[in-house]
């Protein structure tokens, strides 16, 4: 007799997600030398551990404890650059200004970026054909779960001066509903930070207005202060520009504005 | 699929350079790298250097300041420039492709590279 299996609205777990998992994980202890002692198999069994046989509506931060203890890392607490609906520009700064993180810059975030996963309960099953989706069914599954648990303790360590980069082509430039605007927003440490720098990226290629006035930046502006962190805001008006000049800052079209 | 072609390996006396080359059927993009891993008889596989999509070099301490890698991405080519080599260098040259998004390392055939007077 076939086994009834729950269909959920989202997409299924990524094919060969073990294998994913694992493979990422030992490519990047290779290229990061300071993780080297890290034992892959035992990531991937506490990986595994956090979701398989549990109901994919019912994960919770302590289900992911053993993973977070196993990629425990330290990050320079003032280069962590976050991002908001802008990933990949965040990801190609970071890769020419290599001494400033995003949480995919870490262990735990290159793991799992862009992967969807999730188990079913009492089976040891990995679900490949639907997971749960945040809107449409539960906001406590396996994917959710975890982003919100390693941006909230990626948030919580930063210090100094923290980045953010917003993408100034959307609606909402801040959203309070993103993973920046709902977890890490609230979970940087007013004792340890003392300002968050936003930077909006400008979409349009003659899109010369000022975004920082946005009503959305205004918002943000708001919550940090009241969080007695200072707020800073510019406007990157060419993001193309921008990352050229990160990588030959010498260049001498990179005095003007960018 | 990637399919990598290497060249350039051989024999060259200690204090002397080779260039590797590369080609990969596939550019390098989004967060995949290309670069170079050695193996010498009875020693483990070591990652000597590699290049992002947006050409940022990344070095083992052992080769710091004697190897440069690079790439010409209309060719889909990575080049090792290997100067000042010493015997210990001797191994077998492996080129990688890194597809970060399948989680798949593809490799080259192994180019042998011998440093002896």
């Known amino acids: 007799v076939p086994r009834w299996r729950q269909q959920w609205s989202g997409p299924g777990t990524t094919k060969r997600f073990p294998e994913t998992v694992l493979a990422r994980c030992v490519k990047y202890t290779e290229i990061h030398p300071e993780m080297r002692h890290v034992d892959c198999q035992s990531v991937w069994d506490a990986f595994k551990g956090a979701f398989i046989s549990k109901h994919p509506c019912n994960i919770t931060e302590e289900d992911y404890q053993p993973l977070m203890k196993l990629g425990t890392q330290t990050v320079p607490c003032n280069k962590i650059l976050l991002w908001s609906r802008i990933k990949d520009l965040a990801h190609q700064f970071t890769q020419v200004q290599r001494d400033m993180f995003t949480l995919e810059d870490t262990l735990l975030g290159y793991l799992a970026d862009d992967l969807t996963w999730c188990g079913e309960f009492n089976t040891s099953k990995i679900n490949y054909q639907s997971c749960p989706d945040w809107r449409k069914d539960c906001s406590n599954n396996p994917v959710s779960v975890f982003w919100k648990t390693v941006s909230r303790r990626f948030a919580e360590a930063a210090c100094d001066v923290v980045h953010v980069m917003l993408n100034g082509s959307r609606s909402k430039i801040f959203d309070k509903n993103s993973t920046f605007g709902s977890v890490e927003v609230h979970n940087l440490q007013p004792e340890k930070v003392q300002t968050l720098e936003a930077w909006v990226i400008h979409g349009g290629r003659e899109d010369s207005r000022d975004l920082c006035q946005d009503p959305t930046i205004k918002e943000l502006e708001s919550i940090i202060s009241k969080r007695n962190i200072q707020f800073s805001c510019k406007n990157i008006y060419r993001p193309d520009k921008f990352l050229q000049c990160v990588k030959n800052p010498e260049d001498s079209s990179c005095t003007s504005e960018i | 699929q990637v399919k990598l072609q290497e060249s350039g390996g051989g024999l060259v006396q200690p204090g002397g350079s080779l260039r590797l080359s590369c080609v990969a059927s596939?550019?390098?993009?989004?967060?995949?790298?290309m670069g170079w891993y050695r193996q010498a008889p009875g020693k483990q596989r070591e990652l000597v250097a590699y290049i992002t999509s947006l050409g940022i070099a990344n070095y083992a301490d052992s080769v710091k300041g004697r190897f440069t890698i690079s790439s010409d991405n209309a060719k889909n080519t990575v080049y090792l420039q290997m100067n000042n080599l010493k015997s210990e260098d001797t191994a077998v040259y492996n080129c990688?492709?890194?597809?970060?998004?399948?989680?798949?390392?593809?490799w080259g055939q192994g180019t042998q590279v011998t440093v002896s007077s």
């Open positions: 596939e550019r390098i993009f989004s967060r995949n790298t």
């Open positions: 990688n492709y890194w597809h970060y998004a399948a989680g798949r390392d593809y």
